[in-house]
């Protein structure tokens, strides 16, 4: 079992969606889980977020806000074997440029 490299960082505007993928070469039904290391808090173990979905073990975070910032790590495990872990992707949340208050839609804070 081996894992493809993941991006070192991901920048997402406030209120948008973040997609993290965990590509791996497992042909079996590997178990993908996602974990987060919080800003300035590198204690172990990290916070468990939930399972990945689809063949790439995708983690979707809708409606991103500042509190979502941190390092996102996926783990892939086949059966009872020891898991492989990604190096982690750092999520940076940026404030989008101001827009008219009434212009709210799929890609905005109320999404």
């Amino acid at each position: 079992l081996w894992m493809h490299k993941v991006p070192a960082s991901l920048m997402v505007s406030l209120g948008e969606d973040a997609h993290f993928q965990c590509p791996h070469n497992s042909s079996n039904n590997a178990n993908v889980t996602w974990w987060r290391v919080l800003h300035g808090n590198y204690t172990w173990p990290p916070e468990f977020l939930g399972p990945g979905e689809d063949p790439n073990g995708t983690l979707i975070i809708q409606n991103v806000n500042k509190s979502h910032g941190g390092i996102y790590v996926c783990r892939v495990q086949e059966g009872n074997e020891s898991y492989q872990q990604s190096c982690g992707t750092y999520l940076r949340v940026r404030q989008p440029p101001p827009r008219p208050f009434l212009d709210m839609g799929e890609g905005t804070k109320n999404r």
Epitope: D17, G50, G52, I60, N63, N65, R99, M104, G105, E106
Partner: antibody, heavy 121, light 113 residues
């Protein structure tokens, strides 16, 4: 795989309340909006509202404010909708649904099997 | 709120024929980010709705290529090139550009002639 499992059919009396559950698995529950949709006889589909389990934020269709209350329990990955002061017009099938339309060519769309609510004396 | 108007209400077809359903919105569905969040669903009797097309023309995973979506701004069309028995049901368009609330069209019932 992603699953949304709703509670069973309900037969309730006018004026009463009912609470429908939507138990989820297979994704990170806290980070996706959970939507609720009404499918009434001859009424088509109506969006009731949504909840973001991570922080409890809710948005409601104005038509259902005061009628529906959305909650979520992160510990059990379950979303709930309570309908109050029920009348015959509330008789319908109610769906929980998770959808994402983002990225250039990316979509996620999962619905519960539906919960039938019948209001009758 | 954005009002979605579908036509026709009922569409009788013969198997193998082409079917076309129209959806019109009360305001443009082009979002400021350039995307158009117009989607098509099929609901069969006793089932939950199933996503067919998202963002005007993108087929959802597992949807046969006989389904296609087109349109822009306020006018959109779903086409089924060769209708099969499993395609029968009620088709809904939906918008998620101006939300909340998400809004749906009134539905078009595809039935055998």
């Amino acid at each position: 795989q992603v699953q949304l499992q709703q509670s069973g059919p309900e037969l309730v009396k006018p004026g009463a309340s009912v609470k429908i559950s939507c138990k989820t698995s297979g994704y990170a529950f806290s980070f996706s909006w959970m939507n609720w949709v009404k499918w009434g006889p001859g009424q088509g589909l109506e969006w009731i509202g949504r909840i973001y389990p991570g922080n409890g934020d809710t948005n409601y269709n104005g038509k259902f404010k005061g009628k529906a209350t959305l909650t979520a329990d992160k510990s059990s990955n379950t979303a709930y909708m309570q309908l109050s002061s029920l009348t015959s017009v509330d008789s319908a099938v109610y769906f929980c649904a998770r959808w994402v339309y983002s990225g250039n060519n990316y979509a996620v769309d999962y619905w519960g099997q539906g919960t039938s609510v019948t209001v009758s004396s | 709120d954005v009002v979605m108007t579908q036509t026709p209400l009922s569409l009788p077809v013969s198997l193998g024929d082409q079917a076309s359903i129209s959806c019109r919105s009360s305001q443009s569905l082009v979002h400021s980010n350039g995307n158009t969040y117009l989607h098509w669903y099929l609901q069969k009797p006793g089932q939950s709705p199933k996503l067919l097309i998202y963002k005007v023309s993108n087929r959802f995973s597992g949807v046969p290529d006989r389904f296609s979506g087109s349109g822009s701004g306020t006018d959109f069309t779903l086409k089924i090139s060769r209708v099969e028995a499993e395609d029968l049901g009620v088709y809904f368009c939906s918008q998620s550009t101006h939300v909340p609330p998400y809004t749906f069209g009134g539905g078009t019932k595809l039935e055998i002639k």
